[in-house]
């Protein structure tokens, strides 16, 4: 309330016709008065308040806040809700008026020609066809076409309401193109306007461009881009392409629906963009956009257009690569080119083919690099159109962590006689060569625990390696300057430790370090006063030969000589482990049967090995007991058995052409065990030495001086042993005329 007036509660406007529903006949006059407590307004069906001349709203003559609505000659289309409301609030009064027009029982829509009904193919959804009635209790059915189908209200999901229209599950009419309502009055049929059925889907799942990326062309070539769009069912799509050159004459666009499998929940569309002869101005981003009205999805690709075919290496192409033995090496080819070049790899000038260890292509991959992979790798790119070639060399250096040569042998655990001078060597191979080799030592007696040796763990509890400069309590040491030697075709570094007098049993370790790793070798230096071992014969035996091991001890000092052979676990030295002293590891020794005899001052225990095999290799230990102290002394000898190898001739004899009077020198290099006997033949006759024919070096080298015509012929070198023979042949041609000598 305001202005001091008493507060008045606001009531809704009052209509002169106090009914919710009013039914009147067509062509009569509708007049309703509305009274209220403040400014009023009327709303009527179709809301044509501004343009409808037939509807008249006038102020009442007898009171304020009163308006009368008059429609002369009402029609069926005037059926609907008439609402009187206060302008400044939501308060209103409504009456629903049916204008019964039996000639036009359905109210025509505003747009008049036809309506649109949107539906989705969902079993649970209903749709309302808004065929409102001017008569409330009509018998209305729904007609759908094509094919023609009629639906009648069933009191459940299909119904008609004069104020709302015809309600039906949407899937029932999803097949139809159009629907309309039909009413029967006195055997006459009346139809509503037609409603077009639009089945709505709008979801776009994805937009896929093909080729997807990295398309490259040269001027004049044809570009074809396919844009495939997957959507839900009942989707309509607009395609749009965005491209760099808008003024292209040869652009062609084709859009079509793609067939999908029956029962598929998806629809596919394809738009194809074709440019017949691309120019440089066609280079750039191409975007395909698919639009359904309620969704847009896009995808883009960059098209590169080159002036002409070309090939070049990209920046960042390496010139040298370093790797460590065992690494996987990847050398990628970085190139620019169109079309993509053919790629060929060469190593030291030889083509490389892919196999299980090396893969070639855009990337050269060496699965597990080894030293033999060191070298120069050349990659040659060839443009398939212009045949232009580009090459690039990559130098591969394979680094090798230090490897100590002696380590690959069974660790030599020979004993060393007291007081003698001994040299211990470490031959190191490493790439790059080691930047240092250092020697360390510790006492052999350093808390050795046999139980730990059995468990294959380090049996030494003291881990303090001392530098050999600090030889307090040990042997006097001198480390020779490193020497460099070419061994087996490899540059190796040899470090020698000289023990000036072998007084104390000790462990020595050499350690080599380079930039990619370290290697070490532990040498057990076991000093003994007592027994000595000799080998009869004194060379290394070959399989199937016989050998005797003699253990000689001074009989006034020692007694109880026994031979043992160390078992395999005594030899197992794992990387970085300290070797177990054989003499202390009794669990690993096997007693051997041997024969004793004396020669005055010494006892000799002879271990005879007949017909030796590779299994007889290993460490042989002779024990002798001190007569006074009863302390056991031991001495170890490592026996290596050479494998029997059939004769082989390395290298070939070359055919030669010589002039009379010259000298021929040929060499026949053999290998095999036992070493083979070499025999030479000329024209299958044994070659006999004379003044002009000299055989040297166990017949390895043949020299023919002052060659004569009769020296021409087929020469054969034959190497034979008990295991067979090998031979090589060469033909010597002698040119020129034989001159008579003075002597003749």
């Amino acid at each position: 309330a305001s202005g001091g007036l008493p507060s008045v509660s606001l009531h809704p406007p009052r209509l002169s016709i106090q009914k919710d529903i009013l039914t009147i006949m067509a062509n009569t006059t509708l007049q309703i008065t509305c009274r209220g407590q403040r400014d009023l307004d009327w709303l009527w069906p179709n809301n044509q308040s501004g343009s409808e001349k037939r509807v008249e709203v006038t102020e009442c003559s007898d009171s304020f806040f009163c308006k009368m609505l008059t429609i002369p000659k009402v029609m069926g289309n005037d059926t609907g809700a008439y609402k009187c409301f206060y302008r400044d609030t939501d308060m209103a009064s409504v009456i629903y008026v049916y204008v019964q027009d039996y000639r036009s029982p359905f109210i025509a829509s505003v747009s008049d020609q036809h309506g649109v009904v949107y539906i989705t193919e969902n079993k649970n959804k209903t749709v309302v066809i808004p065929c409102l009635g001017s008569i409330s209790n009509l018998n209305v059915s729904l007609c759908a076409r094509y094919p023609e189908k009629r639906f009648v209200p069933d009191g459940n999901r299909i119904s008609w309401d004069s104020k709302k229209g015809f309600t039906i599950p949407s899937y029932m009419i999803s097949y139809a193109g159009m629907v309309f309502c039909e009413a029967k009055i006195n055997d006459e049929s009346y139809q509503s306007i037609m409603y077009i059925v639009v089945v709505v889907g709008y979801k776009i799942y994805d937009v896929i461009l093909s080729p997807p990326h990295g398309v490259e062309l040269s001027v004049g070539e044809r570009l074809v881009l396919n844009c495939t769009v997957r959507t839900e069912l009942n989707v309509g799509l607009d395609f749009n392409w965005e491209y760099p050159s808008l003024k292209h004459q040869h652009k062609k666009l084709v859009n079509r629906d793609l067939k999908t499998q029956s029962g598929s929940e998806m629809k596919k569309f394809l738009s194809t963009l074709t440019i017949d002869g691309v120019t440089r101005s066609d280079q750039g981003w191409y975007t395909c956009a698919a639009s359904s009205g309620l969704m847009t999805k896009r995808n883009s690709t960059f098209i590169r257009v080159h002036e002409k075919p070309f090939v070049a290496f990209g920046s960042g192409m390496e010139s040298s690569v370093e790797a460590t033995v065992g690494d996987r090496v990847r050398i990628p080819v970085k190139y620019l080119g169109y079309p993509p070049p053919e790629i060929k790899w060469y190593k030291n000038g030889r083509p490389i083919e892919s196999n299980h260890t090396i893969k070639v292509g855009h990337v050269l991959t060496i699965m597990e690099v080894s030293e033999k992979d060191t070298g120069n790798y050349t990659v040659i790119l060839t443009n398939p159109i212009s045949k232009e070639k580009q090459s690039h060399v990559i130098s591969l250096v394979v680094n090798v962590p230090p490897q100590i040569g002696e380590k690959s042998l069974i660790s030599p655990v020979d004993s060393y006689q007291y007081g003698t001078t001994q040299s211990l060597t470490c031959t190191v191979y490493a790439v790059p060569p080691p930047h240092h080799i250092r020697w360390y030592w510790q006492l052999e007696e350093c808390a050795y625990k046999p139980a730990q040796a059995v468990l294959m763990t380090n049996p030494y509890t003291c881990k303090e390696w001392r530098n050999v400069d600090d030889f307090q309590g040990g042997n006097k040491i001198e480390v020779n300057k490193n020497q460099f030697a070419l061994i087996e075709g490899k540059n190796k570094t040899v470090s020698t430790l000289v023990i000036q007098a072998a007084n104390v049993s000790a462990l020595y370790k050499c350690e080599a370090v380079n930039k990619v790793g370290r290697g070490e070798r532990v040498i057990s230096f076991h000093v003994i006063r007592g027994p000595e071992i000799t080998l009869q014969p004194d060379t290394q035996p070959t399989e199937q030969e016989s050998v005797s091991l003699w253990c000689t001890a001074d009989r006034t000092t020692f007694e109880n000589l026994t031979w043992y052979k160390s078992g395999p676990q005594a030899l197992a030295v794992h990387a970085g482990e300290v070797p177990t002293p054989v003499c202390k590891n009794l669990d690993a020794l096997w007693r051997m049967n041997a024969t004793t005899f004396s020669n005055g001052t010494s006892d000799i225990l002879i271990l005879e090995l007949q017909n030796v095999s590779l299994q007889d290799q290993g460490d042989y230990v002779c024990f002798a007991q001190d007569r006074k102290t009863k302390k056991r002394h031991c001495v170890v000898r490592q026996l290596t058995v050479l494998e029997r190898v059939a004769p082989m001739i390395t290298g070939n004899l070359e055919n030669q052409t010589t002039s009379i009077g010259e000298t021929i020198e040929v060499s026949c290099t053999t290998s095999g065990n036992p070493p083979p006997q070499i025999t030479w033949f000329k024209d299958n006759e044994t070659l006999v030495e004379d003044s002009g024919i000299i055989l040297k070096d166990g017949n390895r080298n043949l020299t023919i001086r002052r060659v004569r015509k009769e020296d021409e012929g087929l020469y054969t070198c034959q190497a034979c042993s008990v295991l067979g023979c090998a031979k090589v042949e060469a033909f010597f041609i002698v040119e020129g005329a034989q001159e008579k000598t003075n002597l003749e």
Partner: antibody, heavy 116, light 107 residues
């Protein structure tokens, strides 16, 4: 900068007409579906109408069907909503929006008041 | 049409709080759900689409989850600029429909 600038709102009597415009810039307008959403004072959002990029597919909410017409002019980068037979319940702020996976760019909105 | 129901209709929270808003669809909509933020007098702003995909430029403190009928928008640590009304919208079936909104205001 990607943006949508709206114009054309105002006061109109019930049964009257109004045309809303939405000018797009900063993106390729002709590639996107566009739509209109409205918001009655103090109420939530209501989708009104949508149009595909080349105007082939057009949709309306039941509440405006037959009275509103959506259209676009790709040459002018513009979207329109022609509103006829306006009712009091059409009073709202009308927003145009660009359609991608969702309605990602919106105009600033324009108020339409339907009152006598 | 698919009805979208948001709860709560309003929530009072402080800066740094974790805020969770839920949205329920009247039938399954898979993951076709979008979240918008609207500040007074401003247009809505897209936050999350397809239930959990963060729109570019939206801070990572906003996250969405859910599938089928029940969905959640979470603000892990509320910032002063996050006080606004949040709407969910389904994009599964025609016509697109919005939830009634959830107003997040200062406690």
């Amino acid at each position: 900068e990607v943006q949508l600038v709206q114009s054309g709102g105002g006061l109109v009597k019930p049964g009257g007409s109004l045309r809303l415009s939405c000018a797009a810039s900063g993106f390729t307008f002709s590639s996107y579906s566009m739509l209109w959403v409205r918001q009655a004072p103090g109420k939530g959002l209501e989708w009104v109408s949508a149009i595909s990029s080349s105007s082939s597919y057009i949709y309306y909410a039941d509440s405006v069907k037959g009275r509103f017409t959506i259209s676009r002019d790709n040459a002018k980068n513009s979207l329109y909503l022609q509103m006829n037979s306006l009712r009091a319940e059409d009073t709202a702020v009308y927003y145009c929006a660009r359609v991608t996976d969702a309605f990602d760019i919106w105009g600033q909105g324009t108020l339409v008041t339907v009152s006598s | 049409d698919i009805q979208m129901t948001q709860s709560p209709s309003s929530v009072s929270a402080s800066v740094g709080d974790r805020v969770t808003i839920t949205c329920r669809a009247s039938r399954g909509i898979d993951n076709w759900l979008t979240w918008y933020q609207q500040k007074p007098g401003k247009a809505p702003k897209l936050l999350i689409y397809e239930a959990s995909s963060l729109q570019s430029g939206v801070p990572s403190r906003f996250s969405g989850s859910g599938s089928g009928t029940d969905f959640t928008l979470t603000i892990s640590s509320l910032q002063p600029e996050d006080f606004a009304t949040y709407y969910c919208q389904q994009a599964k079936a025609f016509p697109p429909t919005f939830g009634g909104g959830t107003k997040v205001d200062i406690k």
